[in-house]
């Protein structure tokens, strides 16, 4: 619609609400992955880079987390996937490069990979919700 | 063309609950926000939260120990209750859209007087 | 929370003439050059009515003698000219930070 803001010019107060979409999608897409994969070990090789630095308070970075989901989504619960991409598009800035993004062939690095980036990608919105709640923004 | 209506009890005893409804027509609320908002007597508006179109809901902080907004999509209607209510609680009560981020709230519903008197 | 706080809290003007209503957030509503304030109309029973939203954008069927401007944390709603029907009460309200605000209202009168 003509009357939304261009997405990389939303206030806090609608990323909060896009992180409060965000929260039980990536929760439960953990949890989820966790049941399916017991027993897999968090990957010390794999580090999303889910907050920007040059912002007060820190920001979702949504060109950096993207790539890894479309990466993972042919590997995981694509609908979930598919609502995560959806609302993490709208809190993209624009023109912003995305990077691609490669799955480990071996299967059990892939499956330590997708546990990693679910697991820092849900602290990571702990992180940003929690800063967007504490007093002016 | 988008249509609020609440309905709901128009005296509520102090210490009990309250619970509105605002029922949509000309659009679904599994889209967009859905907003409560009261007006107190010598017009003050608060705003009170939300319900979104997944069903996520967020509260003003003032309120978050009485408030419960709530939905039933096969109706197309949400739901305000407050619980625990004083006569600081008598206003005008508002149902709103909130149909994008980045925008405001469009359509309002005609509102609904409750006074809080035992 | 960002207080709004809205002068006059009445205003009396005659038919024809311009009406000037302020509107100033005790923090900036602005974020990457939008502004987050927007202005409703409420006539006696009835509900509020959207007339600017994000600082200067006319809503779709208000009139065009109604007009936004400002940013950061100083805005303004004019009319002109002022017409019988714009007896209401006007409020500002921002939503850039939650919880959501709105200033105390503006109830215009035809002298």
């Known amino acids: 619609s003509s009357h939304m803001a261009p997405t990389h010019q939303l206030p806090p107060s609608d990323v909060r609400k896009i992180i409060l979409e965000l929260q039980p999608l990536s929760r439960g897409l953990l949890e989820d992955y966790q049941k399916k994969e017991t027993g897999v070990p968090e990957s010390n090789r794999t580090l999303l880079l889910c907050l920007t630095s040059d912002s007060q308070p820190p920001r979702l970075n949504s060109s950096a987390i993207l790539p890894y989901f479309r990466a993972i989504r042919p590997l995981s619960d694509k609908n979930i996937i598919d609502k995560i991409i959806e609302q993490l598009d709208k809190l993209k800035f624009q023109h912003e490069p995305e990077t691609e993004i490669s799955v480990p062939a071996d299967t059990f690095e892939c499956k330590s990979f997708i546990l990693t980036i679910l697991q820092q990608f849900s602290a990571c919105l702990e992180s940003v919700f929690k800063s967007l709640n504490s007093g002016p923004q | 063309e988008v249509q609020l209506v609440e309905s709901g009890p128009s005296l509520v005893k102090p210490g009990g609950s309250l619970r509105l409804t605002c029922s949509v027509t000309?659009?679904?609320?599994?889209?967009?926000?859905w907003k409560w908002i009261r007006k107190f007597p010598g017009n003050k508006l608060e705003y009170m939260g939300y319900?979104?179109?997944?069903?996520?809901?967020d509260y003003n902080p003032s309120l978050k120990s009485r408030i419960t907004i709530s939905r039933d999509t096969s109706k197309n209607q949400y739901y305000l209750q407050l619980n625990s209510v004083t006569t600081e609680d008598t206003a005008t009560y508002y149902c709103?859209?909130?149909?994008?981020?980045?925008?405001?709230?469009?359509?309002w519903g005609q509102g609904t007087s409750v006074t809080v008197s035992s | 929370d960002i207080v709004m706080t809205q002068s006059p809290a009445s205003l009396s003007v005659s038919l024809g003439q311009r009406a000037t209503i302020s509107c100033r957030a005790s923090e900036s509503v602005d974020t990457y050059g939008r502004s987050f304030m927007h202005w409703y109309q409420q006539k006696p029973g009835q509900s509020p009515k959207l007339l600017i939203y994000r600082a200067s954008n006319l809503e779709s069927g208000i009139p065009a003698r109604f007009g936004g401007s400002g940013s950061g944390t100083d805005f303004t709603l004019t009319i002109d000219p002022v017409q019988a029907d714009d007896v209401a009460t006007y409020y500002c309200?921002?939503?850039?930070?939650?919880?959501?605000?709105f200033g105390g209202g503006t109830k215009l009168e035809i002298k």
């Open positions: 000309g659009d679904s609320i599994t889209s967009g926000y």
């Open positions: 709103a859209r909130y149909p994008n981020y980045g925008y405001a709230m469009d359509y």
């Open positions: 319900i979104s179109y997944s069903g996520i809901t």
């Open positions: 309200h921002q939503s850039y930070e939650d919880p959501w605000t």
